[in-house]
């Protein structure tokens, strides 16, 4: 079709695709009317001078997954109409200066998954119309000042999965149109104050999986349009009180997998669009009053796998919309009777794997819509009379792995459990720990030498198991029984994600699924 090379396929839509290991050089002659050219999975190792000279109408050029390690500076000469150029997944270590000269229409440049060691201001100085620049998955150790100064129209910049140890506060200063900046999986230890000040249109900032220890108080103060902020899996030990105060558009904030020890009241400044907050895998020891009070629309709050030993009675003030609360795998011994009082719409709460010795009788008093309560693996010996009586929607209650004391005081609980047996699930039932003569026997059928009338077990609503809560990729919750699933790193681009296997798909979330949302 207008001279289609034998190694290629050419469509009537002016699209040419050349693939296969037998290709060792750019095939010729290419159809003069080609608008899209893909050279994929070949053994081409270099691009010489002007291999595309006769296809000046080309709009998109993909040279991906080859053995390409060397490009002559004039390789892309005469491609003034080119809007999309991908050299991803090759073996490029060096980019010649002037390689992109003359590509005046270029909007997307993909250089990801190569072996690039450095970039220089001169590399992109001609690319004034560039909107997207992908440099993730290379070996970049630093970005020189001025590298992006000419890319004033850039809207997406990905520098993830490199070896960056520091960022100059001036490197992004001219990128006023940038909407997405990804710096995940580098070796950044801190971000200088002012680094993001020029990014007034930024909507997504990905800083996860670095080694960031401290955040400057005003780091995000100019980023009023920020919608997604990823800070998970760093070494952040504290949050300056005002760091999140001017992010009214934020709808995603990840802070899990850090070293946070405390959260100050109101730390999460007004964020009316934030619906989920994952804080698992930190070192939080206590929750003060009003710590989440600005998060009026929050639906899911994950605080599992911390070291929380104290929760102030007003810690959850303001969370009127909360549906799911995960507090499992902490160090809680006692809970104030009013701690959940404001959570009128709560449906699921996970408190398993703590050290709870007792619960106040009014702990769930105002939380009438509760569907799932996880209390397994605590230090509970008994529960107050009527603690669950008003919970008409309760369909999953987990009480196993507690040291239940099966004396006559256990009768009210035992009778309630008899009436509500289906809610306990079939996996594991609560068993007596004391006295010694009944240790290991089921709490539900134990004989405590008091006559108990036979009871009819009524139907309870049939709901699926309760929802899961994030816990951690590395530490499965061994008290649950489930099938193997995979955990992965969050917020990546779509290639080469590390996969870690664990043995429980609920370990991270800490609940099964009474509510599915």
């Amino acid at each position: 079709y207008h001279g289609c090379p034998s190694e290629c396929t050419c469509s009537r839509a002016s699209q040419v695709e050349c693939t296969g290991a037998r290709i060792v050089a750019v095939p010729t002659p290419l159809p003069w009317n080609a608008m899209s050219l893909q050279i994929l999975n070949t053994h081409i190792t270099e691009l010489n001078e002007s291999p595309f000279l006769n296809i000046s109408a080309l709009i998109a050029l993909r040279i991906e997954k080859n053995e390409l390690s060397r490009i002559t500076p004039g390789a892309f000469r005469n491609l003034g109409s080119l809007r999309y150029l991908s050299l991803a997944n090759n073996k490029l270590q060096v980019l010649p200066i002037g390689l992109f000269q003359g590509l005046d229409s270029l909007e997307s440049l993909l250089l990801s998954s190569n072996q690039l060691l450095q970039i220089q201001p001169a590399h992109f100085s001609q690319c004034s119309n560039l909107k997207e620049l992908q440099l993730h998955g290379n070996h970049l150790e630093y970005i020189p000042d001025g590298a992006f100064d000419h890319l004033v129209g850039l809207t997406k910049l990905n520098l993830g999965k490199n070896s960056l140890t520091h960022i100059s506060p001036r490197v992004f200063q001219h990128l006023g149109n940038l909407q997405v900046l990804r710096l995940y999986e580098n070796r950044l230890t801190d971000i200088p104050m002012g680094t993001f000040d020029g990014l007034v249109n930024l909507q997504e900032l990905a800083l996860q999986q670095n080694q960031i220890g401290l955040l400057s108080p005003g780091l995000f103060h100019n980023n009023h349009n920020l919608q997604r902020l990823y800070l998970s899996n760093n070494h952040i030990s504290q949050l300056p009180p005002s760091v999140f105060m001017q992010l009214p558009q934020l709808n995603r904030l990840t802070l899990f997998g850090n070293s946070l020890k405390e959260l100050s009241p109101g730390i999460f400044g007004p964020m009316p669009n934030l619906r989920e907050l994952w804080l698992y895998d930190n070192h939080i020891s206590s929750l003060p009053d009003n710590v989440f009070s600005n998060l009026r629309q929050l639906q899911v709050l994950i605080l599992s796998r911390n070291q929380i030993s104290f929760i102030s009675p007003g810690a959850f003030n303001g969370l009127t919309e909360l549906r799911e609360l995960s507090l499992h795998t902490n160090a809680l011994q006692d809970l104030d009777g009013n701690v959940f009082r404001m959570l009128a719409n709560l449906q699921n709460i996970s408190l398993q794997n703590n050290r709870l010795r007792q619960l106040p009788g009014n702990i769930f008093a105002n939380v009438n819509g509760l569907m799932a309560i996880q209390l397994q693996n605590n230090q509970l010996e008994n529960l107050p009379l009527g603690i669950f009586d008003h919970l008409g929607k309760l369909c999953e209650l987990r009480l196993y792995d507690n040291p239940w004391r099966c004396d006559s005081d256990i009768l009210p609980l035992r009778n309630w459990l008899l009436l509500n047996q289906p809610r306990l699930g079939t996996d594991t039932v609560p068993v007596c720990f004391s006295p010694a003569n009944v240790r290991g026997q089921s709490l539900i059928i134990i004989n405590v030498n008091v006559a108990v009338p036979s009871v009819h077990v009524p139907e309870v609503p049939s709901y699926p198991e309760t929802p899961w809560y994030p816990d951690t990729p590395s530490y499965p919750d061994t008290t649950s029984v489930s099938s193997t699933t995979e955990l992965t790193s969050p917020v990546e681009d779509y290639t080469d994600l590390t996969t870690i296997q664990v043995t429980d798909d609920r370990s991270v979330w800490g609940m099964t699924q009474a509510q599915s949302g």
Epitope: R228, N251, R252, R275, E276, R296, Q297, Q299, V300, T320, E321, R323, E324, A344, N345, Q347, M371, Y463, P464, P467, W468, P470, P473, T485, E486, L487, T488, S489, P490, V491, E492, D493, Y494, L497, D505, R506, V508, W509, Q513, Q515, S516, G517
Partner: antibody, heavy 119, light 110 residues
Framework: EVQLVQSGAEVKKPGSSVKVSCKAS????????IHWVKQAPGQGLEWIGL????????NYNQKFKGKATLTVDTSTTTAYMEMSSLRSEDTAVYYC????????????WGQGTTVTVSS | DIVLTQSPDSLAVSLGERATINCRAS??????????MHWYQQKPGQPPKLLIK???SLESGVPDRFSGSGSGTDFTLTISSLQAEDVAVYYC????????FGGGTKVEIK
């Protein structure tokens, strides 16, 4: 551009299994929930369950527990739904869809995969 | 499970006229801030398309002739001026508990 591209139509014998795939592109796969929805011929929509690709955690509609298994492969940004012990009433179009937060609406849908169970 | 009942089952409206579809839930799906009710449009041979989320929030890219209202158990989808391309089946969905859909309302041109 956000896209969910599903695998092609399947014809299966009763008692067998089928695995439908949903390839995601144009968004950060590990940051969204993936839902699965059934639509039997001439019928309405029925929610099967969801999976969160970051941890592989799942929620199921009780009706489909034991029938459907939801998994993901983050390396290929693909979600899967496997249906086992197929019966004629499993004949339907199955959709995958994306949700930003757990309780949010499903804002992007795959084109659907028709599964026909017939002896 | 929460049952969603849509009415009418089908609706014939003249071009340019208003179309109103109702959805009643068997229990409240609202809080003081949110109603966990969403609306979808499905054309023959196509997947559903999100129109309205959280009862009244118009999805990006959806024409503003579509609007949603209601709270508690009663919700309404309104097409202010029916266009030919609006011929479809419309579904409500709740995400308060286990997600369920209404039975659908078929909208045709009179």
């Amino acid at each position: 551009e956000v896209q969910l591209v599903q695998s092609g139509a399947e014809v299966k014998k009763p008692g067998s299994s089928v695995k439908v795939s949903c390839k995601a592109s144009g968004f950060t796969f590990t940051d969204y929930y993936i839902h699965w929805v059934k639509q039997a011929p001439g019928q309405g929509l029925e929610w099967i369950g969801l999976v969160h690709p970051y941890i592989g955690g799942t929620n199921y509609n009780q009706k489909f527990k034991g029938k459907a298994t939801l998994t993901v492969d983050t390396s290929t940004t693909t979600a899967y739904m496997e249906m086992s012990s197929l019966r004629s009433e499993d004949t339907a179009v199955y959709y995958c869809a994306r949700g930003d937060n757990k309780y949010d609406a499903m804002d992007y849908w795959g084109q659907g995969t028709t599964v026909t169970v017939s002896s | 499970d929460i049952v969603l009942t849509q009415s009418p089952d089908s609706l014939a409206v003249s071009l340019g006229e208003r179309a109103t579809i109702n959805c009643r839930a068997s229990q409240s799906v609202s809080t003081s801030s949110y109603s966990y009710m969403h609306w979808y449009q499905q054309k023959p041979g196509q997947p559903p398309k999100l129109l309205i989320k959280y009862a009244s929030s118009l999805e990006s890219g959806v024409p503003d002739r579509f609007s949603g209202s209601g709270s508690g158990t009663d919700f309404t989808l309104t097409i202010s001026s029916l266009q030919a391309e609006d011929v479809a089946v419309y579904y409500c969905e709740q995400s308060w508990e286990i997600r369920t859909f209404g039975g659908g309302t078929k909208v045709e041109i009179k």
